[in-house]
């Protein structure tokens, strides 16, 4: 199987970042985030 590469350099100009909770260690499947300076991080 091919690997899915990951380049972590994101250019964000006051754009909201949205993550799925299951991607960041939760299995509840909810959308989560923390608002910091107009950008959602998780």
């Amino acid at each position: 199987d091919a690997e899915f590469r990951h380049d972590s350099g994101y250019e964000v100009h006051h754009q909201k970042l949205v993550f799925f909770a299951e991607d960041v260690g939760s299995n509840k499947g909810a959308i989560i985030g923390l608002m910091v300076g107009g950008v959602v991080i998780a």
């Epitope: 899915f4 590469r5 990951h6 380049d7 970042l17 949205v18 799925f20 991607d23 499947g29 909810a30």
Partner: nanobody, 124 residues
Framework: EVQLVESGGGLVQAGGSLRLSCAVS????????MGWFRQAPGKEREFVGA????????YYAGSVKGRFTISRDGAKNTVYLQMNSLKDEDTAVYYC?????????????????WGQGTQVTVSS
């Protein structure tokens, strides 16, 4: 190499429906998040919506919320975009894309595999 192949595009009247499919091969389907983007003539490619690896969570751009639905079929390694109540402004080339887990679901750069796109034209 991971391959994404879209199908299902075409010409539809305003108010109509279309279902796009995206078949994924060459990778571990259950380990990646999938998203849909679109690009209208003369405009930048924009986020439409995304679905989680398990398929139990979805997220949509405001412009399509309530009209578009994304689902995924793990047995067929396929992601679907059901588009209802189509409008003229939905006319675009639609792309499916795959991203690694842990990356933003609504940022184009997070997605590192892309399909070739399928044209959707809405006529009034």
């Amino acid at each position: 190499e991971v391959q994404l192949v879209e199908s299902g595009g075409g010409l539809v009247q305003a108010g109509g429906s279309l279902r796009l499919s995206c078949a994924v091969s060459g990778g571990t389907f259950s380990s990646v998040g999938m998203g849909w983007f679109r690009q209208a003539p003369g405009k930048e490619r924009e986020f439409v919506g995304a679905i989680s690896r398990s398929g139990d969570s979805t997220y949509y751009a405001g412009s399509v919320k309530g009209r578009f639905t994304i689902s995924r079929d793990g047995a067929k390694n396929t992601v679907y975009l059901q588009m209802n109540s189509l409008k003229d402004e939905d006319t675009a080339v639609y792309y499916c894309a795959a991203r690694p887990a842990g990356t933003p679901i609504n940022i184009r750069r997070a997605y590192n595999y892309w399909g070739q796109g399928t044209q959707v034209t809405v006529s009034s």
